[in-house]
């Protein structure tokens, strides 16, 4: 028969023949032959391979270095790498999460639109009219101005995006 030019899924072509790939969690020891199957070997502790493969070496599990603000979110297995995330108050600098940076704070005049997570930074938004923020914070949203009317008071000083309104007593009309 004609030697194959392409192989099925989970196979690879070598020496004009289709060999089975090694399953996740195992590495290649020797290619198949006309008479023998592909020989695979499990990855050891601290190693993994996460795909059907013909790799001759397993990959080392990633180290979540605490000196870079990292911690383990999920321990690796023979089929999965370690998943790192960041310590409280920090977030990853990239999708691979190789290091962490401190969550950004929203300056006065800005509030938190979305609180940071281990993988995303704080999202700030300017306080719209009627709202303010007088602190630099990674958690505080813009607060609404105090409603003087509901307290039977009047506005003595207008609010800004950084300050609340100042309420005062109503001027009594003299008879």
């Amino acid at each position: 028969p004609e030697p194959p030019t392409a192989c099925r899924e989970k196979q690879y072509l070598i020496n004009s023949q289709c060999c089975s790939l090694c399953q996740p969690g195992q590495k290649l020891v020797s290619d198949c032959t006309e008479f023998t199957e592909t020989e695979c070997l499990p990855c050891g502790e601290s190693e993994f391979l996460d795909t059907w493969n013909r790799e001759t070496h397993c990959h080392q599990h990633k180290y979540c270095d605490p000196n870079l603000g990292l911690r383990v979110q999920q321990k690796g297995t023979s089929e999965t790498d370690t998943i790192c995330t960041c310590e409280e108050g920090w977030h990853c600098t990239s999708e691979a999460c190789e290091s962490c940076v401190l969550h950004r704070s929203c300056s006065p005049g800005f509030g938190v639109k979305q609180i940071a997570t281990g993988v995303s930074d704080t999202i700030c938004e300017p306080c719209p009219v009627g709202f303010f923020s007088n602190v630099s914070s990674a958690f505080e949203k813009c607060h609404p101005w105090t409603s003087c009317e509901t307290k039977d008071l009047v506005v003595q000083q207008a609010g800004t995006n950084k300050t609340d309104v100042v309420c005062g007593p109503q001027d009594r009309l003299r008879a």
Partner: antibody, heavy 118, light 106 residues
Framework: EVQLVQSGAEVKKPGATVKISCTVS????????IHWVKQRPGKGLEWMGR????????KYDPKFQGKATMTADTSTDTAYMELSSLRSEDTAVYYC???????????WGQGTTVTVSS | QIVLTQSPTIMSASPGEKVIITCSAT?????ILWFQQKPGTSPKLWIY???NLASGVPARFSGSGSGASYSLTISRMEAEDAATYYC?????????FGGGTKLEIK
Amino acid sequence: EVQLVQSGAEVKKPGATVKISCTVSGFNIKDYYIHWVKQRPGKGLEWMGRIDPEDGDTKYDPKFQGKATMTADTSTDTAYMELSSLRSEDTAVYYCTTSYYVGTYGYWGQGTTVTVSS
Amino acid sequence: QIVLTQSPTIMSASPGEKVIITCSATSSVSYILWFQQKPGTSPKLWIYSTSNLASGVPARFSGSGSGASYSLTISRMEAEDAATYYCQQRTFYPYTFGGGTKLEIK
């Protein structure tokens, strides 16, 4: 600083039980497997077993199944190994050690000497 | 279970001499770890994943091998290398150590 600190030396009578501890600092115990290794006086290293502190999963060398019981308390970052029905051949130094990551290369405790003597 | 046999069991080498310690397994393993132990101290991971030196290990050390046959080599023996060396496999449970090689300085 990363450390594995083991409990102190023990002298026990044959038939007794001993529980030794291994407290880690500088990292989270759940991030590693904890292995226990036995070394009799003047002899080589013997792997006894390991525990995954995260879920308590254990693997033992059949030789130590029934002799050793490994547990872990993640709230105190401490692993324990209890040895039962002690005999003179259990006289040894027992080490706790971690799985390794590239960057840590595995950590070892200072060893706990257990002496079994009548 | 996988049995690891180290050879030689004991040896002495002169300063500057090349040293080779072998570790053979009863069947293939993914990798070998090598540990160094000096009297009265805990073992230290010396070589990981067959051929990678742990932090602080001098470059005169190297590791090689695959399948069931592995070795640790010291290109030029130094006095501080006198110790007992153990190989370990962490591929199949139960994990096992070799019997150790005691290396002395002449």
